[in-house]
């Protein structure tokens, strides 16, 4: 199954004064993306 | 089988420290990033540190609340992360958790009572 | 911060009848890409948390699709469209957008 995460986008907001934070990469970091590029328990956004 | 197993809990008094490991098995750990979290005795949960990869500089980010006094950090060879907890306060009572945010611990109970 | 707010704390439900959680945020969850960071957690009795939704809407692998998250980027549902005994618990919502990340303060399911 295709990685509907991709590195070069990763993150999901940056707002001046904000903390940074990387939702998308902590998706792409689980520990159920490193068993499986697929569907434990993060399967592909519909 | 994905495994996330906390240890170091312990009855401890205000000001003293405490180190919390998280021993993990079954995934590549490397690539993935870990936090602590801590639900109070009040069922609140507290997301208290993250830490991120190799690949991010292993990168650590902490909640207000602990911020200078708890440090995260992992051992890639160990695929173990620990929480190094100085100066305990009574408030720091709490069942702490290790987590990917979609696996958990079994979660370790760390009581700070004079 | 980003402050989570749950309705109702507590809810008691008829086996086989639906439930509906709500979670407020007082500030949008909705990142880049459209994608809207509310996750939903159950807690049962003794256990650790359990994902059960991600990103609003995205029902975790091996969660039965009785449960069902939706939302827009403030106000988010999560529906049990037909309650059973394993359900009971506290469910949390969480946002792992911004520093702090944050949970909700929970709600308890019990059964009538």
């Known amino acids: 199954l295709a990685d509907p995460l991709d590195h070069r986008d990763a993150g999901d907001l940056w707002v001046p004064g904000e903390s940074e934070s990387f939702e998308d990469a902590h998706v792409e970091h689980s520990i159920s993306r490193s068993l499986l590029e697929g569907e434990i328990p993060f399967p592909p956004t519909s | 089988e994905v495994q996330l197993v906390e240890t170091g809990g312990s009855l401890v008094q205000p000001g003293k420290s405490l180190k919390l490991t998280c021993a993990t098995s079954?995934?590549?750990?490397?690539?993935?990033?870990m936090h602590w979290v801590r639900q109070s005795p009040e069922k609140q949960l507290e997301w208290i540190a993250h830490?991120?990869?190799?690949?991010?500089?292993?990168?650590?980010y902490y909640a207000e609340s602990v911020k200078g006094r708890f440090t995260i950090s992992r051992d890639d060879s160990k695929t173990t992360i620990y929480l190094q907890m100085n100066s305990l306060k009574e408030a720091d009572t709490a069942i702490y958790y290790c987590?990917?945010?979609?696996?958990w611990g079994q979660g370790v109970m760390v009581t700070v009572s004079s | 911060d980003t402050v989570l707010t749950q309705a109702p704390l507590s809810v008691s439900v008829t086996p086989g009848e639906s439930a509906s959680i709500s979670c407020r945020s007082n500030?949008?969850?909705?990142?880049?890409?459209?994608?809207?960071?509310l996750y939903w957690y159950l807690q049962k009795p003794g256990k650790s948390p359990q994902l059960l939704i991600y990103?609003?809407?995205n029902l975790a692998s091996g969660v039965p699709d009785r449960f069902s998250g939706s939302g827009s980027e403030t106000d988010f549902t999560l529906k049990i469209s037909e309650v059973e005994t394993e359900d009971v618990g506290v469910y949390y919502c969480?946002?792992?957008?911004?520093?702090?990340?944050?949970f909700g303060p929970g709600t308890k399911l019990e059964l009538k």
């Open positions: 987590t990917g945010l979609d696996y």
């Open positions: 079954g995934f590549p750990f490397s690539n993935v990033w």
């Open positions: 830490i991120k990869a190799k690949s991010d500089n292993y990168a650590t």
């Open positions: 500030k949008s969850l909705l990142g880049i890409r459209d994608i809207t960071s």
């Open positions: 990103r609003m809407s």
């Open positions: 969480a946002q792992f957008l911004r520093y702090p990340y944050t």
